[in-house]
C-alpha cells in the first residue's frame, strides 16, 4: 500500500560535507517497526546510500560504516549524511516502509537535491 512521504526540495551541504534533512511520513496506522532507506538518483541510476530499521520510540541504528546518522520523533526522521563531496551532488530520496504490524506500507519522497561544494584549499602561508 502507498503512503505519503515529504522531504525538502533542496539542501546545501555545509563546508564539512554534511547535509541534514527531515523525512516526514503520513502513517496510516500504528506502526511499531519502520525501515528508512536513503536512495541517490544520478546518471540514470538509483543507488542505496544507507538504511536503518527502528522500533517506534527508539533511535535509528545505521551500520557502523554508514555515512548516515539519524533520529526519529513520531512520524519524522531527521537524517544526516556525512562525508559528502562535490561529486556526490544529486537527488537523495527518502523511502519509508512500515514493516510491522501488517499491512505493509511503502512511501517514497520526491527527493531532496543536495548540493555539495568542495571547499577551496587554504593558501600556503609564508
Amino acid at each position: 500500500k502507498a503512503m505519503h512521504v515529504a522531504q525538502p526540495a533542496v539542501v546545501l551541504a555545509n563546508s564539512r560535507g554534511t547535509a541534514s534533512f527531515v523525512c516526514e511520513y503520513a502513517s496510516p496506522g500504528k506502526a511499531t517497526e519502520v525501515r528508512v532507506t536513503v536512495l541517490r538518483q544520478a546518471d540514470s541510476q538509483v543507488t542505496e546510500v544507507c538504511a536503518a530499521t527502528y522500533m517506534m520510540g527508539n533511535e535509528l541504528t545505521f551500520l557502523d560504516d554508514s555515512i548516515c546518522t539519524g533520529t526519529s520523533s513520531g512520524n519524522q526522521v531527521n537524517l544526516t549524511i556525512q562525508g559528502l563531496r562535490a561529486m556526490d551532488t544529486g537527488l537523495y530520496i527518502c523511502k519509508v516502509e512500515l514493516m510491522y504490524p501488517p499491512p505493509y506500507y511503502m512511501g517514497i519522497g520526491n527527493g531532496t537535491q543536495i548540493y555539495v561544494i568542495d571547499p577551496e584549499p587554504c593558501p600556503d602561508s609564508d
Partner: nanobody, 126 residues
Framework: EVQLVESGGGLVQPGGSLRLSCAAS????????IGWFRQAPGKEREEVSC????????NYADSVKGRFTISRDNSKNTVILQMNSLRAEDTAVYYC???????????????????WGQGTQVTVSS
C-alpha cells in the same frame, strides 16, 4: 551506460507459454519504469505491458489481459514477462524498454521510454 537485453523468445505452439526476460548491462533497473512492446510484420508497434519503478503498478493491453504477467526480479536485476495461452496473433518481435523517472513518478508507468533493447522474436505456430 545501461543497455537492455531481451531473452526467452522462440517458437511455441498455440496454447503454450514463454517467459521473456529483460536484463540490464552496465547498471541496474532499480526503480526504472519498464515496458514491453511488440511489433508484428506489417503492423505498428504496440505496448503490451508495463511495470512501475516500485513494482506496485502494472498495466496490460486488452489483447493480453489475463494471459500475460509482468514482474520485477530485483535480485537478478531483471523484469519478466510471463506469456501464457499464446495465440498465433501474439507472433511478433518483443522489445523491452525502460526509463528512470523522477521519484514522484516511481509509482507510475512511463509515457515514453528512453532506452530500447534489440528485441527477441516470438513465433506462435503449430
Amino acid at each position: 551506460e545501461v543497455q537492455l537485453v531481451e531473452s526467452g523468445g522462440g517458437l511455441v505452439q498455440p496454447g503454450g507459454s514463454l517467459r521473456l526476460s529483460c536484463a540490464a548491462s552496465g547498471g541496474t533497473l532499480d526503480y526504472w519504469s519498464i515496458g514491453w512492446f511488440r511489433q508484428a510484420p506489417g503492423k505498428e508497434r504496440e505496448e503490451v505491458s508495463c511495470i512501475s519503478g516500485t513494482g506496485l503498478r502494472t498495466n496490460y493491453a486488452d489483447s493480453v489481459k489475463g494471459r500475460f504477467t509482468i514482474s520485477r526480479d530485483n535480485s537478478k536485476n531483471t523484469v519478466i514477462l510471463q506469456m501464457n495461452s499464446l495465440r498465433a496473433e501474439d507472433t511478433a518481435v518483443y522489445y523491452c524498454t525502460g526509463k528512470l523517472l523522477h521519484p514522484s513518478l516511481w509509482s507510475a508507468c512511463a509515457n515514453e521510454y528512453d532506452l530500447w533493447g534489440q528485441g527477441t522474436q516470438v513465433t506462435v505456430s503449430s
